[in-house]
């Protein structure tokens, strides 16, 4: 008789999840000499231990502490790039500007990027059929709690000038409900962080508006200022050209406006 299984509203665990996490860990530790000491089997065991046999709506930050400890990593605290709703461009940028780092450039962020996972209460099985959706099912699910935990730690580590890329094409350029708006903003440490600098990425080719005047950006400025952190905002009008010119400033097309 097939055992009854809870049906969640979200997609199930990414196929070949254990193999993917292990392979990513091995690849990352090979590329980053400062993380060569990491034992990837122990990392996978700690990752697995955070959610296997636990109810996928009852996961806590505490569950991830063994993994956090194994994945402890020092990135230059003044070279941090946060992002909201514009992950691809942020990652393309740090691939070119190699001295800046997004969360996904760290070991733990790299392991979990774009993956989904969950288990089942009281069984050692991984659920490949469905996992809880943050909105429709529950917020304390394995994926959401993981990102909340690593995002909080990443923001807490930041110092000096912290940059954030925001999507100027969205109706809410700054969204209080995003991970950036609900977690990272509130965990920047005013005694270490002098300035939060927002880079608003424009979508339209002919869009010459100053999106730094957008009401949601003003809301972000207000939240940040109340936390005794200075705020600065920049418009990136031509993100494609911007990236190209960061990559190769001598390029002839970079001698005109970007």
């Amino acid at each position: 008789v097939p055992r009854w299984r809870q049906q969640w509203s979200g997609p199930g665990t990414t196929k070949r999840f254990p193999e993917t996490v292990l392979a990513r860990c091995v690849k990352y530790t090979e590329i980053h000499p400062e993380m060569r000491h990491v034992d990837c089997q122990s990392v996978w065991d700690a990752f697995k231990g955070a959610f296997i046999s636990k109810h996928p709506c009852n996961i806590t930050e505490e569950d991830y502490q063994p993994l956090m400890k194994l994945g402890t990593q020092t990135v230059p605290c003044n070279k941090i790039l946060l992002w909201s709703r514009i992950k691809d461009l942020a990652h393309q940028f740090t691939q070119v500007q190699r001295d800046m780092f997004t969360l996904e450039d760290t070991l733990l962020g790299y392991l979990a990027d774009d993956l989904t996972w969950c288990g089942e209460f009281n069984t050692s099985k991984i659920n490949y059929q469905s996992c809880p959706d943050w909105r429709k099912d529950c917020s304390n699910n394995p994926v959401s709690v993981f990102w909340k935990t690593v995002s909080r730690r990443f923001a807490e580590a930041a110092c000096d000038v912290v940059h954030v890329m925001l999507n100027g094409s969205r109706s809410k350029i700054f969204d209080k409900n995003s991970t950036f708006g609900s977690v990272e903003v509130h965990n920047l440490q005013p005694e270490k962080v002098q300035t939060l600098e927002a880079w608003v990425i424009h979508g339209g080719r002919e869009d010459s508006r100053d999106l730094c005047q957008d009401p949601t950006i003003k809301e972000l400025e207000s939240i940040i200022s109340k936390r005794n952190i200075q705020f600065s905002c920049k418009n990136i009008y031509r993100p494609d050209k911007f990236l190209q010119c960061v990559k190769n400033p001598e390029d002839s097309s970079c001698t005109s406006e970007i």
Epitope: D210, C212, C233, K234, C245, S256, E257
Partner: nanobody
Framework: DVQLQASGGGLVQAGGSLRLSCEFS????????MGWFRQFPGKEREFVAA????????DYSDSVKGRFTISRDNVKSTMYLVMNSLKPEDTAVYYC???????????????????WGRGTQVTVSS
């Protein structure tokens, strides 16, 4: 810390020259336009010159065109303003600023800038 620090001001005879510098320290990434403004006593700051992020595009106010030259060195994180053929009416406090964008679209407007340095006094005697 992001700091813009203008220096190089002083007292000079009419017809003389000065070179102002603006160091933009604390920057991981210097991909934004920058500009020079000046302020006469009791007046608003006025635009003098601006330069885009790469140094390839510049803009000058009519009153300084042909006499002043703006440039930048992103490796040294410094912007310059070479001021030749100085006139007594150039006497002012000069400020450097970092723009809200990489290019010169709104470079003549004060609102187009969001980081300002402390000023440096330039006095031209006749």
């Amino acid at each position: 810390d992001v700091q813009l620090q203008a220096s190089g001001g002083g007292l000079v005879q009419a017809g003389g020259s000065l070179r102002l510098s603006c160091e933009f320290s604390g920057r991981t990434f210097s991909g934004f336009a920058m500009g020079w403004f000046r302020q006469f006593p009791g007046k608003e700051r006025e635009f003098v010159a601006a330069i885009n992020w790469s140094g390839s595009s510049v803009d000058y106010s009519d009153s300084v065109k042909g006499r002043f030259t703006i440039s930048r060195d992103n490796v040294k994180s410094t912007m310059y303003l070479v001021m030749n053929s100085l006139k007594p009416e150039d006497t002012a406090v000069y400020y450097c600023a970092e723009a809200r964008s990489a290019e010169l679209g709104s470079s003549r407007k004060i609102q187009g800038y969001d980081q300002w340095g402390r000023g440096t006094q330039v006095t031209v005697s006749s």
